[in-house]
């Protein structure tokens, strides 16, 4: 058993038929010695008396909020949560496996630049009795600080017959060094509580691997005289690291016809302009990627040819 | 070529070669489809590689103040990786494919290190750890780890030279 936060405890249980469970001793936080009784939130009966209560925690019926009372007055609470381990594997019932970039990916994270700020998100189909808390650090043996905000519900979408809820959190490395080569990964730890079930999820990454620039901005077309060609120009996104002579991007310019089946013309360039042929009803799109490290491409910025 | 004693390197040549190194490092080990190498306990294998750290002066301000600290650090790393790519980790079994970019990568590392430090001028170089994996699969894993680490290193080096070429060239 260990303390998650004040008055909230996690009991780790090997989950198999007829498992012996874990003996837990609860102590009432009071100077009182006599006349103390104990109750469990989901049951109306008195469980025991005295300053301490010993319980055998085997299943969810044994978890919950234990309260000690004296003469109708509440003295203190202890909330017991269960963390299930089956066949040596901790349960992952609360979050949805996003399966990208690989199986058992519950947390996904992205950064728009090298400032040490990043966002992580996760998915669940659960909407009630659900809480999250997030911690992060750089490295684990001698951790350096990363500050995370509160997890918030960032999107709600319908997937088939079901609703899916996306939660996200923003974190910032306390002493970020954008120009350095990372040697220790960022560790992100999410504590998830659904009803009386506790689970934890972790992700480990280098900022450089989760970089995804915002799309290029101010995408413009300038027709060239007596030609079907146009000069496409754009700018670095505002959120990208500066100076751009140091933190450089490379770009992919695509001409795409109305039909998805039409051949796409693609040009790669390090400049912020390119000359392409603009076909009728086509659109021109540009996306960006770190010039020197192959992390994710940005989403496309697009303009119609007409 | 760099001139010993604090003169500027040939920023533009270094920029071109370092950008080529980035391309080669990624073609030698594309990210897609490989295992997450950080899960494979890399502390003991790749923690000894030289990293370009916060105090090494490789940020834009540090380069403006005195680029020599950073260039020395980059040179150390280039020599280190050049030696690793020439070691039995890469030359032993399983053999690399004939058209593997590792050979070009090895030559380019050497080329950039020589641009930074001509013959007769010596910066101290870092000791190469003795990594001699016995099993072919260990060697394969180590190759992946070294190449992943090299990708990060050459990205920083390329940024340094790009910035130098744009702002510090005579």
């Amino acid at each position: 058993i260990w303390e998650l936060k004040k008055d909230v405890y996690v009991v780790e249980l090997d989950w198999y038929p007829d498992a012996p469970g874990e003996m837990v001793v609860l102590t009432c936080d009071t100077p009182e010695e006599d006349g103390i009784t104990w109750t469990l939130d989901q049951s109306s009966e008195v469980l025991g008396s005295g300053k301490t209560l010993t319980i055998q925690v085997k299943e969810f019926g044994d978890a919950g909020q234990y309260t000690c009372h004296k003469g109708g007055e509440v003295l203190s609470h202890s909330l017991l949560l269960l963390h299930k381990k089956e066949d040596g594997i901790w349960s992952t019932d609360i979050l949805k496996d996003q399966k990208e970039p690989k199986n058992k990916t519950f947390l996904r994270c992205e950064a728009k630049n090298y400032s040490g700020r990043f966002t992580c998100w996760w998915l669940t189909t659960i909407s009630t009795d659900l809480t999250f808390s997030v911690k992060s650090s750089r490295g684990s043996s001698d951790p350096q600080g990363v500050t995370c905000g509160a997890a918030t519900l960032s999107a709600e979408r319908v997937r088939g017959d079901n609703k899916e809820y996306e939660y996200s959190v923003e974190c910032q490395e306390d002493s970020a060094c954008p120009a350095a080569e990372e040697s220790l990964p960022i560790e992100v730890m999410v504590d998830a509580v659904h009803k009386l079930k506790y689970e934890n999820y972790t992700s480990s990454f280098f900022i450089r691997d989760i970089i995804k620039p915002d799309p290029p901005k101010n995408l413009q077309l300038k027709p060239l005289k007596n030609s079907r060609q146009v000069e496409v120009s754009w700018e670095y996104p505002d959120t990208w690291s500066t100076p751009h002579s140091y933190f450089s991007l490379t770009f992919c310019v695509q001409v795409q016809g109305k039909s998805k089946r039409e051949k796409k013309d693609r040009v790669f360039t390090d400049k912020t302009s390119a000359t392409v042929i603009c076909r009728k009803n086509a659109s021109i799109s540009v996306r960006a990627q770190d010039r020197y490290y192959s992390s994710s491409w940005s989403e496309w910025a697009s303009v119609p040819c007409s | 070529r760099a001139v010993p004693g604090g003169s500027s390197p040939a920023w533009t040549q270094c920029q071109q070669l370092s950008q080529k190194l980035c391309t080669l490092a990624w073609s030698a080990h594309p990210l897609v489809g490989h295992m997450d190498l950080r899960e494979e306990g890399d502390e003991e294998t790749t923690n000894d590689v030289p990293h370009i750290q916060c105090g090494d002066g490789c940020d834009p301000q540090g380069l403006r103040d005195n680029s020599q600290f950073c260039l020395q650090r980059i040179h150390q790393g280039l020599i280190f990786y050049e030696k690793l790519l020439g070691s039995d980790i890469f030359t032993g079994e399983p053999s690399l494919l004939p058209d593997s970019p590792v050979g070009q990568l090895h030559a380019s590392l050497l080329g950039l290190s020589q641009l930074l430090q001509p013959e007769g001028h010596h910066w101290e170089t870092q000791q190469i750890p003795s990594l001699s994996p016995s099993q072919p699969w260990q060697r394969l894993l180590l190759r992946f780890k070294i190449l992943r680490s090299l990708q990060a290193f050459v990205a920083v080096a390329a940024r340094v030279f790009a910035h130098g070429a744009a702002t510090l060239s005579p």
């Epitope: 939130d41 919950g64 009795d129 | -």
Partner: antibody
Framework: QIQLVQSGPELKKPGETVKISCKAS????????MNWVKQAPGKGLKWMGW????????TYADDFKGRFAFSLETSASTAYLQINNFKNEDTATYFC??????????????WGQGTLVTVSS | SIVMTQTPKFLLVSAGDRVTITCKAS??????VAWYQQKPGQSPKLLIY???NRYTGVPDRFTGSGYGTDFTFTISTVQAEDLAVYFC?????????FGGGTKLEIK
Amino acid sequence: QIQLVQSGPELKKPGETVKISCKASGYTFTNYGMNWVKQAPGKGLKWMGWINTYTGEPTYADDFKGRFAFSLETSASTAYLQINNFKNEDTATYFCARSLSTMITTTFAYWGQGTLVTVSS
Amino acid sequence: SIVMTQTPKFLLVSAGDRVTITCKASQSVSNDVAWYQQKPGQSPKLLIYYASNRYTGVPDRFTGSGYGTDFTFTISTVQAEDLAVYFCQQDYSSPYTFGGGTKLEIK
């Protein structure tokens, strides 16, 4: 002991409004969520939604968004269900049901006796 | 929404028999399943929560089991007062849905 006592049966014309009450006793009203469940004659149970008795925030199941409203009178430990523009298909017994615990909102440990609301045509 | 398919719809048994009702969820609901008993003319009563935990005061002849999508409710020795409709309910994901019910009749 814990009790949920609901208001009596109602006979309503189509288009009218009905407001059912559910008075709680024997526990701290604001500690536990209050759910509403519909049971059409001879049919199964359908969860309508719940109201957070501490914040007053209601949550409605998709089928009960629009004409249905949950509300509270905390000082009287009472929850209300209002149905506007009453329709034939609203004829049912409506139950209020208290959550099992502060941590388990949508398992129902205590139920009101039910209020039958019938449409009169 | 998650569909809870409960079988059988009707059960005609004798006192002393063992009865098993099953509930199948259309997707995994972990162990977030409750079972209720509704006697004629009464409101439902909670018997089992978290798939296998008997609620306070519920006789130990009532048991529940299951995880994921398949859940079972058992009355080990049926008694005359067990005449009722039994419902399963998933309380994993909103909207929290009930099975269609199983009507237990005593011969």
